[in-house]
């Protein structure tokens, strides 16, 4: 890979010194390094009106390196660029600029948003949610027995969180009222949520009202039905055999 040197070849300065410092192979008092020791990068730094040659193990910020056969040379990136692949392609912009497709911009183009962590223009990401999971069993105060009217809940997962300018996520919990055939609680039965239960078709006249609720919580006020239920549970001493609950699936 020998270089053929043209008429513009750099001539050695009259003050060329062999006693060079800092990785220089040849140098001059006026221009600093003129060439570097193997594997070091040659960079011209402007100091006032003068350009001083310096030899470094890698190119400084704002420069990129080219390993020619006869010289490793640092070339300046564009003024707004901190790290670049070459003159055309910046990979990290200086403070206050956003990187977009190899260019440094004051503001991100329409349809993109600034990521202030990476300082890049990125696509706006909208929220994505899964399909609803099935409704939970009809429960009341954590129990699945000893009541007629309760609530059931369903949830869905956030598949993709939105970026700053993206559409916000819709509610991920939904709670609605449900009516079941009252069944007595057996002694010690806790009837916790999540217990598998066969679902039957709704009884005539029974219905449920869907109440979307982003927090997935019913109102904390006690209804007359809830009070009645409590009293009945207190009065019960003898438990009947467990009845299967009937969940009503009509939604208005």
């Amino acid at each position: 890979q020998n270089a053929s040197r043209g008429r513009r070849q750099r001539r050695m300065h009259p003050n060329v010194s062999q006693g060079c410092q800092g990785g220089c192979a040849t140098c001059s008092d006026y221009n600093g390094c003129l060439s570097c020791k193997p594997r070091l990068f040659f960079v011209l730094e402007r100091i006032g009106m003068k350009q001083i040659g310096v030899c470094l193990s890698s190119c400084p910020s704002g420069y990129y390196g080219t390993r020619y056969p006869d010289i490793n040379k640092c070339t300046k990136c564009k003024a707004d660029c901190d790290t670049c692949f070459n003159k055309n392609f910046c990979t990290k912009c200086k403070s206050g600029f956003y990187l977009h497709l190899g260019k440094c911009l004051d503001n991100c183009p329409e349809g993109l948003e600034a990521n202030n962590h990476t300082m890049e223009c990125v696509n706006i990401v909208h929220c994505e949610v899964s399909e609803w999971n099935p409704w939970s069993p009809c429960t009341k105060k954590g129990k699945t027995c000893g009541f007629k009217r309760g609530t059931e809940t369903r949830v869905r997962e956030i598949m993709q969180h939105p970026s700053a300018k993206g559409n916000l996520c819709p509610p991920t919990n939904e709670t609605r009222k449900c009516t079941v055939q009252r069944k007595k609680c057996q002694k010690g039965e806790r009837g916790k949520k999540g217990r598998e239960r066969k679902r039957k078709k709704p009884n005539k006249g029974e219905s449920k009202e869907a109440i979307p609720d982003s927090k997935g919580l019913e109102s904390s006020k006690e209804t007359p039905e809830q009070r009645e239920n409590k009293q009945q549970q207190k009065k019960r001493k003898v438990q009947d055999k467990q009845q299967k609950s009937v969940s009503v699936s009509t939604v208005h």
Partner: antibody, heavy 116, light 107 residues
Framework: EVQLVESGGGVVQPGRSLRLSCAAS????????MAWVRQAPGKGLEWVAT????????YFGDSVRGRFTISRDNSKNTLYLQMNSLRAEDTAVYYC?????????WGQGTMVTVSS | DIQMTQSPSSLSASVGDRVTITCLVS??????FVWYQQKPGKAPKLLIY???RLQDGVPSRFSGSGSGTDFTLTISSLQPEDFATYYC?????????FGQGTKLEIK
């Protein structure tokens, strides 16, 4: 819009010479190292030669060193490739390209056929 | 010189397929690596630079990854216009060297 337009290709006998030219526009020609890359029929890409931005240094691939010379005229935004002692294996499309680590801009290519 | 081993040399795929092309480099080149696309009778076009960065105008279905000696070009969902030949190139040092190319054909 960046444009690189090659010319000078054609059919030439082995041992003869040919000079390719490349007219550049749409970018600051004098800021860029320029190169020639060739592609033999049905084959891959092969780097031929690069000349640095100011014309002071040039580099050549092993297969052409000593036979080809690369030059440029920054006042005319033109790149040249002088090909001497041509061989059958030099038959290829020759592309003019701006070479800055990657080959960022390409011409449409000019075909050189070396045949007796 | 740095050697580039690109595989496969040819590949048949259908529209909508996910396709991966790999390039192995004979020495550590950090991320000084480029991918090109070439269509018949046309000049190569730079697709990806610095191993993973998309050139302006290149669709986001193209992506590049890797560092050191192993590099990959992925097309997430092939489109009719993607059937072409793809070349890798190391930009780490002279002489610049290319992979042998991968011809992507319609199945």
């Amino acid at each position: 819009e960046v444009q690189l337009v090659e010319s000078g290709g054609g059919v030439v006998q082995p041992g003869r010479s040919l000079r390719l030219s490349c007219a550049a526009s749409g970018f600051t020609f004098s800021d860029y190292d320029m190169a020639w890359v060739r592609q033999a029929p049905g084959k891959g890409l092969e780097w031929v030669a690069t000349i640095i931005y100011d014309g002071s240094r040039a580099y050549f691939g092993d297969s052409v060193r000593g036979r080809f010379t690369i030059s440029r005229d920054n006042s005319k935004n033109t790149l040249y490739l002088q090909m001497n002692s041509l061989r059958a294996e030099d038959t290829a499309v020759y592309y003019c390209t701006a070479h800055d680590r990657s080959f960022d801009y390409w011409g449409q290519g000019t075909m050189v056929t070396v045949s007796s | 010189d740095i050697q580039m081993t690109q595989s496969p040399s040819s590949l048949s795929a259908s529209v909508g397929d996910r396709v991966t092309i790999t390039c192995l480099v004979s020495e550590d080149i950090s991320n000084d690596f480029v991918w090109y696309q070439q269509k018949p009778g046309k000049a190569p076009k730079l697709l990806i630079y610095a191993a993973s960065r998309l050139q302006d105008g290149v669709p986001s279905r193209f992506s590049g990854s890797g560092s050191g000696t192993d590099f990959t070009l992925t097309i997430s969902s092939l489109q009719p216009e993607d059937f072409a030949t793809y070349y890798c190139q190391q930009s780490y040092k002279y002489p610049p060297t290319f992979g042998q190319g991968t011809k992507l054909e319609i199945k």
